[in-house]
């Protein structure tokens, strides 16, 4: 139903606490450079205004759209142009163009220092002084670094953060209590951020149909007992919620998400038996629980897929009469039977089936043409299975660091134009997928690997779009969302690349490397490795092994030496000469 005042409606639905949190997230995600204090001031102004509208929905400006109210607030900031430059030009536009303009200025890679965690004592002191302000600061710092973070989920993580501090700040050993809890929150929040970023990219770059297909596959895997009609209803609501959050309409998004959770709990009998444990929880936990829910057991006695999608003489008629419904049904039926497949695989299979029908239904004897469709789709299943098996074998053999090195070489050969720090960052991220997924049982390995790779490649694509350097990367990123991973996997050595001239500076090390934490030491070595590949992209595996072995021996020798710097100065040039000879 239509409300006189949208902002009053959302304030009433969400309550003051969540309302303020969401306003803070909205401002922090759009104005990523502004200090916390400025945002707090604006949050209080918006909240006071909303309260006035609750008291009198007909009061001045209360009838305006929320996005317009936010836009007006932003455009009234006196220092907007000097802080944000051309973002201020958005203010000359009318809504909805102004909203779109603001969105385009969100920065996925803001130039902000890493979000460092203070010592437990300092954390607890600040928390006890003013816990609302402390949690507000957490929302602000996360939001400005992750401008597409799923806002209602961020409120959930803030609540978890608050609970951890409430408990651990009373503990005798604060660090022992806090560290594992905060590490777990951080890791989960980073995955959540990447998942939402993929959803927004899917909607923004590939459209609603792509997002709906993704959602049908995921929900069908989780709720295999639900009917297709029920899945479709949820997907329609979920699409609305996701569009709102991706579009920066966070109050509407959070409110509609609450409504969706309520609907699912009211209809849990026709969705999933697993919802029971979620539906007794309070608002934020309820929606989070549903998002993370374990998949339901498969219904017994499911008929063979071929019955409806191959043997049935009505296939082309059904395809012609309601193409999206028919393909949606295929995706639903296939996904609920295959919880072990990744979303990407399921969507590629559905795409392959669609392409086959497009071809066969135009023939005089369609059935003869599509009779073997499932056999023809088998390579779409075999390829990722084989890839995961090979990579997990390599991971088991080399360990995480060695596996990262192998990936650094592989990806530098695929896209040598990409900057060295970026290649190292992605080799490390891709390598960590081995740690996350390779130890899982066979049934979970495949989906774990491909679903994580989709998140990492999406981040790569977003950053590459900002500063494109490789046509091959652009092609893999933009042609098809579901074929991104196979596209990157299929890239080999870039034959068009002119090797980088040899710079001794890239391979010069000093004694300071010896005292670096292990992670930073690895990054330094991996930077050198990437530079080496850029210099000799066609070097063999054996040559690379030799060079890396010499390099490790050199570092060990000099870091163990009494006069470390002298060792580096003397042996460094010898190592560089030896490496050049090995690679010649």
């Amino acid at each position: 139903e239509a409300h006189k005042s949208e902002i009053a409606h959302r304030f009433n639905d969400l309550g003051e606490g969540h309302f303020k949190g969401l306003v803070l997230i909205t401002l922090s995600q759009h104005l990523q450079k502004s200090p916390f204090e400025e945002h707090v001031k604006l949050v209080n102004e918006v909240t006071d205004f909303a309260k006035a509208c609750v008291a009198d929905e007909s009061a001045q400006n209360c009838g305006k759209a929320i996005a317009t109210l936010f836009g007006d607030k932003v455009c009234a900031i006196p220092s907007l142009r000097e802080t944000y430059g051309e973002l201020a030009d958005c203010c000359a536009k009318e809504d909805p163009d102004r909203v779109e303009c603001f969105l385009q200025h969100k920065d996925d890679n803001p130039n902000l220092p890493p979000f460092e965690r203070p010592e437990p004592e300092a954390l607890c002191t600040a928390f006890k002084e003013n816990n609302d302000r402390f949690i507000g600061h957490y929302l602000y710092e996360v939001s400005r670094r992750h401008p597409y973070f799923y806002a209602p989920e961020l409120l959930y993580y803030a609540e978890k953060y608050k609970n951890a501090l409430t408990e651990c700040c009373e503990a005798a050993d604060k660090a022992a209590c806090l560290t594992p809890k905060l590490d777990a929150i951080k890791e989960k929040a980073l995955v959540s951020s990447a998942q939402q970023r993929l959803k927004c990219a899917s909607l923004q770059k590939f459209g609603e149909r792509a997002f709906k297909a993704w959602s049908v596959a995921r929900l069908s895997q989780k709720f295999p007992k639900a009917e297709f009609a029920e899945i479709s209803t949820i997907v329609t609501s979920l699409t609305k919620v996701t569009k709102e959050c991706c579009h920066g309409d966070l109050l509407e998004c959070a409110d509609d998400r609450q409504e969706l959770a309520k609907y699912m709990c009211e209809h849990q009998d026709s969705i999933s038996s697993k919802l029971k444990e979620c539906c007794v929880k309070p608002t934020l936990q309820k929606a989070h629980c549903i998002l993370e829910i374990q998949r339901d057991e498969l219904p017994t006695e499911l008929p063979d897929l071929a019955v409806d999608f191959v043997e049935d003489k009505e296939v082309c008629k059904n395809f012609a009469e309601a193409k999206d419904v028919f393909l949606g049904t295929f995706l639903y039926e296939y996904s609920r039977r295959h919880p072990e497949y990744s979303i990407g695989m399921l969507l590629r299979i559905a795409k392959g089936y669609e392409a086959k029908l497009e071809k066969c239904c135009a023939e005089a004897d369609p059935h003869a043409c599509y009779a073997k469709v499932f056999d023809e789709l088998q390579p779409l299943i075999d390829e990722p299975k084989k890839l995961v098996q090979q990579n997990c074998e390599l991971f088991d053999k080399l360990g995480e660091y060695g596996f990262q090195n192998a990936l650094a070489v592989r990806y530098t050969q695929k896209a040598p134009q990409v900057s060295t720090p970026t290649l190292v960052e992605y080799a490390r991220k891709l390598g960590s997928v081995g740690t996350k997924c390779c130890s899982l049982p066979e049934t979970e390995r495949l989906s774990c690997t491909e679903n994580y790779l989709a998140l990492i490649l999406n981040r790569l694509c977003i950053l590459h779009e900002k500063t494109p350097v490789s046509e091959r990367v652009t092609k893999c990123c933009t042609e098809s969302l579901v074929n991104r991973r196979p596209c990157f996997s299929a890239l080999h050595v870039d034959e068009t690349y002119v090797p980088k001239p040899f710079h001794a500076d890239s391979f010069t090390f000093h004694a300071d490397i010896c005292t670096l934490p292990e992670k930073e030491k690895q990054v330094k070595k991996q930077m050198a490795l990437v530079e080496l590949v850029k210099h000799k992209p066609k070097a063999s595996e054996e040559q690379m092994k030799t060079v890396m072995g010499d390099f490790a021996a050199f570092l060990k020798k000099c870091c163990d030496a009494d006069n470390k710097e002298a060792c580096f100065t003397e042996d460094g040039p010898k190592l560089v000469a030896k490496c050049q000879a090995t690679l010649a």
């Epitope: 003489k313 009469e321 135009a362 023939e363 369609p366």
Partner: nanobody, 115 residues
């Protein structure tokens, strides 16, 4: 919505001819092979003939081969069945269908072959 409207049926003597038409709408006509199916009183549906989306390939049931000709005009979204040398056993309701479907979408058109 998909719509198939058949026309051109009637009463004809054995050995006579008829031309059936099927006007299609609500889908991309050129992307689908089309078929004619018939159903005699008290019997199940029987496939008669099919044609590819481009019109280049045709298939016929043995019972009509050499007597019936299927064709299509993609510019008019229309499917045709030219029936020559009609026999009493050709008496049936004729339906056009999408792909190899045997179930009808339209109302059909009645062909009666009788002296």
């Amino acid at each position: 919505d998909v719509q198939l409207v058949e026309s051109g049926g009637g009463v004809v003597q054995p050995g006579g001819s008829l031309r059936l038409s099927c006007a299609a709408s609500g889908f991309t006509f050129t992307s689908f092979g089309m078929s004619w199916v018939r159903q005699a009183p008290g019997k199940g549906p029987e496939w008669v003939s099919s044609i590819s989306g481009s019109g280049s390939d045709t298939l016929y049931a043995d019972s009509v081969k050499g007597r019936f000709t299927i064709s299509r005009d993609n510019s008019k979204n229309t499917l045709y069945l030219q029936m020559n040398s009609l026999r009493p056993e050709d008496t049936a309701a004729y339906y056009c269908t999408i792909g190899g479907s045997l179930s009808r979408s339209g109302q059909g058109t009645l062909v009666t072959v009788s002296s």
